[in-house]
């Protein structure tokens, strides 16, 4: 009997109620592999999800997030609200980054500007809510005979919190 079921192709299921005949998956269901005893219910892309690929008898529907949201998780299992650059998402909605912090993405959280002085450098370009500061050479680096060594990675004060 098991052999009979293994002959059922994708898009069908092995129907125990009908002497293990291969029956097509009912509407809104699918089987992506052969030999299945049931068909799986198709995923529905609703609410903050939109359909990227319709369900067929052999493959599940695929969802994306609607405009203004981004996908998280395997196969876009979650949608999280976008914010603008220079903002972060809180429970009360999108909030501007606090002074001294920035976010260059439409998702995620604000993080502190680089502290150029920790590397003995000066601020070449000021930071904004959307962009980190740009560190430039310290006055000593510009003096004659100064070393042209590769600068270390940018430093930030540890434990700095955005709010």
């Amino acid at each position: 009997l098991q052999d009979l079921c293994s002959n059922c192709p994708a898009g069908t299921f092995c129907d125990n109620n009908r002497s293990q005949i291969c029956s097509p998956c009912p509407p809104n269901s699918f089987s992506s592999a052969g030999g299945q005893r049931t068909c799986d219910i198709c995923r529905q892309c609703k609410g903050v999800f939109k359909t990227r690929k319709e369900c067929s008898s052999t493959s599940n529907a695929e969802c994306d997030c609607i405009s203004g949201y981004h996908c998280l998780g395997a196969e876009c299992s979650m949608c999280e609200q976008d914010c603008k650059q220079g903002q972060e998402l809180t429970k009360k909605g999108c909030k501007d980054c606090c002074f001294g912090t920035f976010n260059d993405q439409k998702r995620g959280i604000c993080r502190p500007w680089t502290n150029c002085s920790l590397d003995g450098k000066s601020v070449l370009v000021n930071g904004t809510k959307e962009r980190d500061v740009v560190c430039g050479p310290s006055p000593a680096d510009l003096s004659p005979g100064a070393s042209s060594a590769t600068p270390p990675a940018p430093a930030r004060e540890p434990g700095h919190s955005p709010q």
Epitope: L72, M78, E80, E88, T90, K91, G108, I109
Partner: antibody, heavy 116, light 109 residues
Framework: QVQLVQSGAEVKKPGESLKISCKGS????????ISWVRQMPGKGLEWMGK????????NYSPSFQGQVTISADKSISTAYLQWSSLKASDTAMYYC?????????WGQGTLVTVSS | DIELTQPPSVSVAPGQTARISCSGD??????AHWYQQKPGQAPVVVIY???NRPSGIPERFSGSNSGNTATLTISGTQAEDEADYYC???????????FGGGTKLTVLG
């Protein structure tokens, strides 16, 4: 598809140093936070800290500040957790996870055993 | 930092409703997330942002969050729901994530 693959189990002696890794693939590694989570044997989840690989900005739980160092090398899409001097109480499963609030992808975990 | 407190264990008969609480000062001001962890496996999100259910998570899982308590509710609990459950929140004050201590859900019988 998105994956976080962690380095293998480690057995160490107290006082030794250790660096474990978490390699991301299938997404823009530089622009998503990576968090580290500890689970001691038979105990719950503890958030240790996080790193933004794009610029290596780190932020630690007060409980783990100064105890461990989190780093990343975006050129090879890998985050690290390291100890300079292990203690027996560091014996635990360590997970990396993508995100800072919602952890949508997790590594398989690295079991660290510290015993003399 | 905020501390999240969960009951160590909850028992429920199959088909009944299980409720797992997560209490913390004004947790309702922040998003709460819930993770399920089965033995030998990494955690999996079952509820995010208080009440949203990822696709692939059964409809019997739901969540709420207000005041000082977030709650995970499993209606018509099944044997496969037996696992450890953890609440978590991200706090903008400390720029940190906090997990609750975890609740072991036992499905009787």
């Amino acid at each position: 598809q998105v994956q976080l693959v962690q380095s293998g189990a480690e057995v160490k002696k107290p006082g030794e140093s250790l660096k474990i890794s978490c390699k991301g693939s299938g997404y823009s590694f530089s622009t998503y936070w990576i968090s580290w989570v500890r689970q001691m044997p038979g105990k719950g989840l503890e958030w240790m800290g996080k790193i933004y690989p794009g610029d290596s900005y780190t932020n630690y739980s007060p409980s783990f500040q100064g105890q461990v160092t989190i780093s990343a090398d975006k050129s090879i899409s890998t985050a690290y957790l390291q100890w300079s001097s292990l203690k027996a109480s560091d014996t635990a499963m360590y997970y990396c996870a993508r995100g800072y609030g919602i952890f949508d992808y997790w590594g398989q975990g690295t079991l660290v055993t510290v015993s003399s | 930092d905020i501390e999240l407190t969960q009951p160590p264990s909850v028992s429920v008969a199959p088909g009944q409703t299980a409720r797992i609480s997560c209490s913390g000062d004004n947790i309702g001001d922040q998003y709460a997330h819930w993770y399920q962890q089965k033995p030998g496996q990494a955690p999996v999100v079952v509820i995010y942002q208080d009440k949203n259910r990822p696709s692939g998570i059964p409809e019997r899982f739901s969540g709420s969050n207000s005041g000082n308590t977030a709650t995970l509710t499993i209606s018509g609990t099944q044997a496969e729901d037996e696992a450890d459950y953890y609440c978590s929140t991200y706090t903008f004050v400390g720029f940190t994530t906090v997990f609750g201590g975890g609740t072991k859900l036992t499905v009787l019988g």
